[in-house]
């Protein structure tokens, strides 16, 4: 594939990555799949600067990110190491709360209204953010 050197239409470029901000809601798995079909992934937050950028664009709305612990350990969807990486949880989060009565705990992370993170039921239909890195090989064939 060819290297992607600029962002697709309707995506926002920032620090050599492209971001797409949804305006509708999906369950985490559906949001994850949507991003993958766009040759991207749910947003992976690696710095305070990136956190502020995303927060500015989403506003005070619950929004999925690419972080989950559905198989036990917290994992970023692109393989970024959770343990050593940037974290911005709300106080007392993540709490894997079972009291919602929907079954299971809370395995998927989202930005809350103040930008800090919370874990929630993955089936909730929240907005989401896709991210793809510039300079990575695109799946599309090169233009001749």
């Amino acid at each position: 594939g060819s290297e992607r050197t600029c962002c697709p239409v309707n995506w926002v470029e920032h620090e050599r990555s492209c971001y797409w901000f949804s305006r509708s809601g999906k369950a985490w798995a559906d949001a994850d799949n949507y991003c993958r079909l766009e040759d991207a992934h749910l947003v992976v937050v690696t710095s305070w600067e990136e956190q502020k950028f995303v927060q500015h664009h989403i506003g005070p709305v619950n929004t999925w990110m690419g972080l989950h612990d559905q198989n036990g350990p917290w994992k970023w969807v692109d393989g970024t190491d959770y343990e050593t990486g940037f974290k911005n949880w709300r106080p007392e989060q993540p709490d894997d709360w079972y009291g919602h009565g929907l079954g299971g705990g809370e395995d998927c992370a989202h930005f809350t209204d103040d930008g800090r993170w919370n874990d929630d039921v993955c089936q909730r239909p929240y907005r989401w953010v896709c991210e793809t890195e510039l300079d990575k090989a695109s799946q599309e064939p090169p233009l001749l």
């Epitope: 974290k87 709490d95 709360w97 079954g103 705990g105």
Partner: antibody
Framework: EVQLVESGGGLVKPGGSLRLSCAAS????????MNWVRQAPGKGLEWVSS????????DYADSVKGRFTISRDNAKNSLYLQMNSLRAEDTALYYC??????WGQGTLVSVSS | DIQMTQSPSSLFASVGDRVTITCRAS??????LIWFQQKPGKAPKSLIY???SLQSGVPSKFSGSGFGTDFTLTISNLQPEDFATYYC?????????FGGGTRVEIR
């Protein structure tokens, strides 16, 4: 590498007390719910208690409610189980577990006169 | 409380066999089910989560299926290291509950 190391087990008389500890390393302890699960000799697994990352959600099995207290110290990466009014039927290997995916090797509690 | 009924309680099989273990919940637990393997003197090890997803590092010979109340664990091409006790566990709601276990023994 994730490690959970239980300690504090031993032989105690009925009605006695023990405090189990679990030392965690290799992961961000304050991001995880922790559980105690026990296994009586030659028997199956029985969940005992659970505590959320910041200790704000705690649950117990009916069989230990009012006698056992779960707690954690995130600054020390440690999980605890205070066991009071012990009974013969509490005799078991007690495992500390991170959520549902990773378990320690257990510490043996024997309650006998 | 949700009861988990596992069957059979034990089974005898030969190397190369394909074995199936079942687990039934007393009420709907969606897919909040884990399968564990336990070898003598060792801690349980998770094999399958959300009823059918393979835990990382676990060989694909292990597979899980089911939703709601009925679940199965299948082990294909049984090898000597697979002879162990297997447990299901629901994590739909507290109290968390386990099946009684299935001991897979060499015929």
């Amino acid at each position: 590498e994730v490690q959970l190391v239980e300690s504090g087990g031993g032989l105690v008389k009925p009605g006695g007390s023990l405090r189990l500890s679990c030392a965690a390393s290799g992961f961000t302890f304050n991001s995880y719910r922790m559980n105690w699960v026990r296994q009586a000799p030659g028997k199956g697994l029985e969940w005992v208690s659970s505590i959320s990352s910041s200790s704000n959600h705690i649950d117990y099995a009916d069989s230990v409610k009012g006698r056992f207290t779960i707690s954690r110290d995130n600054a020390k990466n440690s999980l605890y189980l205070q066991m009071n009014s012990l009974r013969a039927e509490d005799t078991a290997l007690y495992y500390c577990a991170r959520g549902t995916d990773y378990w320690g090797q257990g510490t043996l509690v024997s309650v006998s006169s | 409380d949700i009861q988990m009924t596992q069957s059979p309680s034990s089974l005898f099989a030969s190397v190369g066999d394909r074995v199936t273990i079942t687990c039934r919940a007393s009420q709907d637990i969606s897919n909040y089910l884990i399968w564990f393997q336990q070898k003598p003197g060792k801690a349980p090890k998770s094999l399958i989560y959300t009823a059918s997803s393979l835990q990382s590092g676990v060989p694909s010979k292990f597979s899980g299926s089911g939703f709601g109340t009925d679940f199965t664990l299948t082990i294909s091409n049984l090898q000597p290291e697979d002879f162990a006790t297997y447990y299901c566990q629901q994590y739909h709601s507290f109290p968390l509950t386990f099946g009684g276990g299935t001991r897979v023994e060499i015929r």
